[in-house]
């Protein structure tokens, strides 16, 4: 039975040209995290494998930095980076947990950094 939940930063906004940290946290399970995939819609951004380390997609290597931790740092943001991001946790023995983050990249300096909503987003599946 999958008891874990993914906590994410929820909906976040950032300024064009700036950076943002995408972060998820798996809690309420003793399952071992073997790999975390970061995806933007259906496009792979990066993989963090517990044994092999990081794989950053070549298309993003110049503006995606691994970490902190299992998170991902997006740099030199453009308005095209606006959209859904997913952290996909592969675990043993539970299976796969998925968290969702929505990033809005704003033209102006009114972008607020950090979560707009205090309640973390939970979503998991096999």
């Amino acid at each position: 039975m999958m008891t874990g939940t993914i906590e994410t930063t929820g909906n976040i906004s950032a300024e064009k040209g700036g950076s943002i940290i995408l972060q998820c946290h798996l809690s309420s399970t003793t399952a071992q995290v073997t790999q975390v995939n970061w995806e933007q819609q259906d496009q792979l951004l990066a993989i963090c494998n517990a044994d092999l380390g990081w794989h950053i997609s070549p298309s993003f290597k110049d503006r995606v930095a691994p970490g902190p931790g299992l998170g991902l740092t997006l740099q030199s943001l453009t308005v095209n980076d606006t959209g859904e991001y997913f952290c996909i946790y592969h675990t043993y023995p539970d299976g796969t947990y998925t968290g969702r983050i929505f990033l809005e990249v704003l033209e102006s300096s009114v972008a607020e950094h950090g979560a707009r909503f205090q309640i973390p987003h939970h979503h998991h599946h096999h």
Epitope: L44, N49, D51, W54, S57, P58, S59, K61, H90, T96
Partner: antibody, heavy 119, light 107 residues
Framework: EVQLVQSGAEVKKPGASVKVSCKAS????????MHWVRQAPGQGLEWMGR????????KYNEKFKSRVTITVDKLSSTAYMELSSLRSEDTAVYYC????????????WGQGTTVTVSS | DIQMTQSPSSLSASVGDRVTITCRVS??????LAWYQQKPGKSPKLLVY???TLAEGVPSRFSGSGSGTDFTLTISSLQPEDFATYYC?????????FGPGTKVDIK
């Protein structure tokens, strides 16, 4: 066109070291990780390790960890694999292989370098 | 280490035949499996990654399927240039390991 051109065949004595080079062209060298895989005569494929040419960070197969060192020279877009304390069982073809777009598999391979260990 | 087995270890087939090669893995690797083709004296060539995604330039007669621990590579209509040895490889943990290979030769 992606090309990985490896150095020539080597004959080494037991206990010696060998350093094989792999010159990459046709793509941005620092954007793609590089793997090293070997194949003993008539045998299957054995993964040795991988390196991030951008950071120089590497991961090794535990079997080779004490004997193998993978490095890169970013200026010349060249990866290197050095294997020390050679024994006859290390006689094999050594391949460099570029990591793919979507994970830890290899999408382009060098032509291979034959290393013979013999007294 | 993750163990990989392939069956059959060798097979004889004719041009036009449908060929299926199986790869079994000792633990769940989700869909992180690649297939390679190797001809004598040549380097391996990537055919499939992520279990079912065809690599660039690979003919559509090749297809991959499976997830978890059981995977297959299918050649729908064997061509003369397909006689070779085929290896599966998981791309999920350290060490990356390959199957022992399946040699496809002419009947």
């Amino acid at each position: 066109e992606v090309q990985l051109v490896q150095s020539g065949a080597e004959v080494k004595k037991p206990g010696a070291s060998v350093k094989v080079s792999c010159k990459a062209s046709g793509y941005t060298f620092t954007n793609y990780y590089m793997h090293w895989v070997r194949q003993a005569p008539g045998q299957g494929l054995e993964w040795m390790g991988r390196i991030d040419p951008d950071s120089g960070g590497s991961k090794y197969n535990e079997k080779f960890k004490s004997r193998v060192t993978i490095t890169v020279d970013k200026l010349s877009s060249t990866a290197y694999m050095e294997l020390s304390s050679l024994r006859s069982e290390d006689t094999a073809v050594y391949y460099c292989a570029r990591e793919g777009h979507y994970g830890f598999y290899s999408d382009y391979w060098g032509q291979g370098t034959t290393v013979t260990v013999s007294s | 280490d993750i163990q990989m087995t392939q069956s059959p270890s060798s097979l004889s087939a004719s041009v036009g035949d449908r060929v299926t090669i199986t790869c079994r893995v000792s633990e769940n690797i989700y869909s992180y499996l690649a297939w390679y083709q190797q001809k004598p004296g040549k380097s391996p060539k990537l055919l499939v990654y992520n279990a079912k995604t065809l690599a660039e330039g690979v003919p559509s007669r090749f297809s991959g399927s499976g997830s978890g621990t059981d995977f297959t590579l299918t050649i729908s209509s064997l061509q003369p240039e397909d006689f070779a040895t085929y290896y599966c490889q998981h791309h999920y943990g350290n060490p990356l390991t390959f199957g022992p290979g399946t040699k496809v030769d002419i009947k």
